[in-house]
């Protein structure tokens, strides 16, 4: 019965970008400006998302697909479909309720978003620290001390921190 009904339903012939207009004898009408339908057989078109304020338009709305937003410089997307924009911090910092704060000793953040993470524990893998960590960089692990040739220094000072470092994604 369901299949028969759908075959007889004139709305099922309405393609994406149109809607089945009940006010006009179920004729397929194009979506009005600033609206879209991404699938066929729709009885209404959805209102396009508007990218305002800290959001900027990444992809314009079309009759068949919604607009997509990203964030203005200095902010990065959070949530599915970039539902929120969050302030960037510098490398070596994390965003708290009180704003951007430096990473504590023993932690780092090599991006403009996210949290400060503990330096990798190289010994977990039986390795040694090859390059020391900084606020902006994780340690680099190297061979286990037993693998080093006699007289070889095991720890390299950290590479100088540079901007922009890891770009926000």
């Amino acid at each position: 019965f369901e299949r028969t009904r759908s075959l007889q339903d004139p709305c099922s012939n309405c393609p994406a970008g149109t809607f089945c207009d009940n006010n006009r004898n179920q004729i397929c009408s194009p979506c009005p400006p600033n609206s879209f339908s991404s699938a066929g057989g729709q009885r209404t078109c959805d209102i396009c998302r508007q990218c305002k304020g800290v959001f900027r338009t990444r992809k314009e709305c079309s009759s068949t697909s919604n607009a997509e937003c990203d964030c203005t410089p200095g902010f990065h997307c959070l949530g599915a479909g970039c539902s929120m924009c969050e302030q960037d911090c510098k490398q070596g910092q994390e965003l708290t309720k009180k704003g951007c704060k430096d990473c504590c000793f023993g932690t780092f953040n090599d991006q403009k978003r996210g949290i400060c993470r503990p330096w990798t524990n190289c010994s977990l893998d039986g390795k040694s620290v090859l390059v020391n960590g900084t606020k902006e960089r994780d340690v680099v692990c190297g061979p286990s001390p037993a693998d080093l040739s006699p007289g070889a220094s095991s720890v390299t000072p950290p590479a100088p921190a540079r901007e922009p470092g890891h770009s926000p994604q």
Epitope: L124, C141, A159
Partner: antibody
Framework: QVQLVQSGAEVKKPGASVKVSCKAS????????INWVRQAPGQGLEWIGN????????NYNQKFKDKATITADKSTSTAYMELSSLRSEDTAVYYC????????????WGQGTTVTVSS | DIQMTQSPSSLSASVGDRVTITCQAS??????LNWYQQKPDKTVKLLIY???RARSGVPSRFSGSGSGTDFTFTISSLQPEDIATYFC?????????FGQGTKLEIK
Amino acid sequence: QVQLVQSGAEVKKPGASVKVSCKASGYTFTSYWINWVRQAPGQGLEWIGNIYPSDSYTNYNQKFKDKATITADKSTSTAYMELSSLRSEDTAVYYCTRDYGSAYSMSTWGQGTTVTVSS
Amino acid sequence: DIQMTQSPSSLSASVGDRVTITCQASQDISNYLNWYQQKPDKTVKLLIYYTSRARSGVPSRFSGSGSGTDFTFTISSLQPEDIATYFCQQGDTLPYTFGQGTKLEIK
């Protein structure tokens, strides 16, 4: 020893989705980044994104942001990558990799999963 | 994104030859440069990380050098089992990027 074992080859139709798995063993799964890398036929390597399984924090290459979704299941030490709205140009070998101890290099690679998109 | 320009794209050399591959980054990546070997069966292996550090178990004929934007990978004495494609990769900045690869063949 450290091992990453990927799921088998997949053949999909355009518009479909596919979920590739990467089962880790021989180390503490939550302590290392898992990356996904692709190689189209006759082409070089492209980094898709990565995940830190401890808290499922992800990074994506902007190019793949609308194509790939990376997840991890701590209980089974398995990482996943789902590819949506497949097109013929998504035909490639997909590798999962583990970092060497810090995210800056990839020390262990899975055997690769071939995804073929064809009508 | 940081572009990695690797050369040559292919090379043919004899067993025992010294082979050099170069990789140039479009901006300073400090020492965050890695070299990978992809065998004909598609298996991939990290050989050199942090520019010059050979992974344990990697034969001493493989070495790397450089800093900043210019890097070199050397096989001091080519062996038949070194037939592979070699890739450089920068780990300095997201998104991580690879060179186009160098396909190495034996004469």
